[in-house]
Interface confidence: medium
Amino acid sequence: DFGLDCDEHSTESRCCRYPLTVDFEAFGWDWIIAPKRYKANYCSGECEFVFLQKYPHTHLVHQANPRGSAGPCCTPTKMSPINMLYFNGKEQIIYGKIPAMVVDRCGCS
Amino acid sequence: DFGLDCDEHSTESRCCRYPLTVDFEAFGWDWIIAPKRYKANYCSGECEFVFLQKYPHTHLVHQANPRGSAGPCCTPTKMSPINMLYFNGKEQIIYGKIPAMVVDRCGCS
C-alpha cells in the first residue's frame, strides 16, 4: 500500500495527500480545549483507471460498469487518531482518542 | 453507523449502496476457480453536506475548504471479505480470505 504526497506547489493531478492544518479556534469550536489546531491533511486529485486503487472491489465495479457507478474517487485509505481534550454535552472535560482525524494516505475507492 | 440501501428502481439521489453481482467468468478471469460470481455491491449517489459522513475529518476539511478539495464522495465505509479459491502467479492453487470484496455500507468521505 502506498499513496502520493503533494503540496500546494505540486503539479500532480492524480489522487494525492495534501497538507492541511485544521484550526478549531478559527472555526469557533471553543468546546475543544486542546489541541487548538492540528495537521489533518486531505485528499484531492483524479482517479484514473487502476491508479492507487485500495481494493480489488474498485477494479471489479469498474469492469462491471453498473448504471450510476461514478468511478472511484480520491478518498482517505489510511487514517489515524489524535488525542483531544474537550467538553462533552454535559460540560464534563473529556480526554480521549478521537479516531480518523488525520489522513495518512489517500487512494482511489 | 448506518447507510442507505437502494436498488435499480430507487429514486434516491443521495449516497446509497446498490446491488451488483460480479461475474468473474464474464470478465474472463479464469484464474479464479471459485466463486465464479458473487454479490459485491457498489456505492453511488450525491454527498450533500454532513449526509452520511463517516469521519469528523470529512466535516473539518469541508469547513477549512482548502484549494482543490472536491468535497466528500460516496464510497464504501464498511467492507467484508470473501473466501476464494484461485491460482497465484506461481500456478499454485490458493484458498484464502480476500479482504474488502463486498460493500456492506456506503457513506460520504
Epitope: - | E25, D30, I33, A34, K36, N83, L85, F87
Partner: antibody, heavy 124, light 107 residues
Framework: QVQLVQSGAEVKKPGASVKVSCKAS????????MHWVRQAPGQGLEWIGN????????NYNQRFKARATLTTDTSTSTAYMELRSLRSDDTAVYYC?????????????????WGQGTLVTVSS | DIQMTQSPSSLSASVGDRVTITCKAS??????LSWFQQKPGKAPKTLIY???RLVDGVPSKFSGSGSGQDYTLTISSLQPEDFATYYC?????????FGQGTKLEIK
C-alpha cells in the same frame, strides 16, 4: 447449454496408445477443472485425474500417472486424455466430466456435466 | 487411498418401496460425498453432493445423510425409472475413489 462431446470408439492393439478428446461448449472452458473417469465393462467407476485448462495444472491417480497424460487446447475448448502402453484391462468407457464449484472450499464441488463416453477396446 | 465400501452390491425392490444404500469410507471424509445414478449405456448423473444436498432438478424422493465415515442414500418411493446402478464418490482427498456400486433391480 453446457455440453461435453467426446470422440468416437477406438480399437487398439496391446502396447499402442489412444488419445480421447472431449469438446466443451456453452461455458468458459478455461475456468473449470475437467476430470476423466473410466469404467471397465460391467465394472465400477475409476478416477483417472483432472486438469485445469487455464494453466494446464493437473492431478493424477497414481495408478495412471506413468501412462496417462491429460492436456487441453484452449483455442478449440477441447480436453484430451492419452493413455499409453495399452493392455487388455484398459478396455473401458472413458468419460470426461466438468467439476462445478458450488462453494469456495477446495472440495466444494460436484460433477454437473458428463461427456457421453468413449469406448476404447484393447484387443490383439 | 481412501476405500469406499458400498452395500448392498445388488438389491431387489418393488415400485413404491423405500430403499437405502450405504457407503462406508475407510477414514473420515468430512461429508465430501456424492451419489450418482447410472443407467445402462449412459454416463453417470449426480444426484446428491456434500452428503445431503440435492442437485437442482433431481426429485426430492432422493435424499442423502451421514457424516464422518458412514453415509446413506435413500429413495423414498421407487418408480420404474429409478431402477439403475448407484455409486458413491469421496472427494475429500486425491485420488478420488468410488464405491463399487449397487445395482437396484425390479423384484
Amino acid at each position: 447449454q453446457v455440453q461435453l462431446v467426446q470422440s468416437g470408439a477406438e480399437v487398439k492393439k496391446p502396447g499402442a496408445s489412444v488419445k480421447v478428446s472431449c469438446k466443451a461448449s456453452g461455458y468458459s472452458f478455461t475456468g473449470y477443472f475437467m476430470h476423466w473417469v473410466r469404467q471397465a465393462p460391467g465394472q465400477g467407476l475409476e478416477w483417472i485425474g483432472n486438469i485445469y485448462p487455464y494453466n494446464g495444472v493437473s492431478n493424477y491417480n497414481q495408478r495412471f500417472k506413468a501412462r496417462a497424460t491429460l492436456t487441453t487446447d484452449t483455442s478449440t475448448s477441447t480436453a484430451y486424455m492419452e493413455l499409453r502402453s495399452l493392455r487388455s484391462d484398459d478396455t473401458a468407457v472413458y468419460y470426461c466430466a466438468r467439476r462445478y464449484y458450488y462453494g469456495t472450499g477446495p472440495a466444494d464441488w460436484y460433477y454437473d456435466v458428463w461427456g457421453q463416453g468413449t469406448l476404447v477396446t484393447v484387443s490383439s | 487411498d481412501i476405500q469406499m465400501t458400498q452395500s448392498p452390491s445388488s438389491l431387489s425392490a418393488s415400485v413404491g418401496d423405500r430403499v437405502t444404500i450405504t457407503c462406508k469410507a475407510s477414514q473420515d471424509i468430512n461429508s465430501y460425498l456424492s451419489w450418482f445414478q447410472q443407467k445402462p449405456g449412459k454416463a453417470p448423473k449426480t444426484l446428491i453432493y456434500r452428503a445431503n444436498r440435492l442437485v437442482d432438478g433431481v426429485p426430492s424422493k432422493f435424499s442423502g445423510s451421514g457424516s464422518g465415515q458412514d453415509y446413506t442414500l435413500t429413495i423414498s418411493s421407487l418408480q420404474p425409472e429409478d431402477f439403475a446402478t448407484y455409486y458413491c464418490l469421496q472427494s475429500d482427498e486425491f485420488p478420488l475413489t468410488f464405491g463399487q456400486g449397487t445395482k437396484l433391480e425390479i423384484k
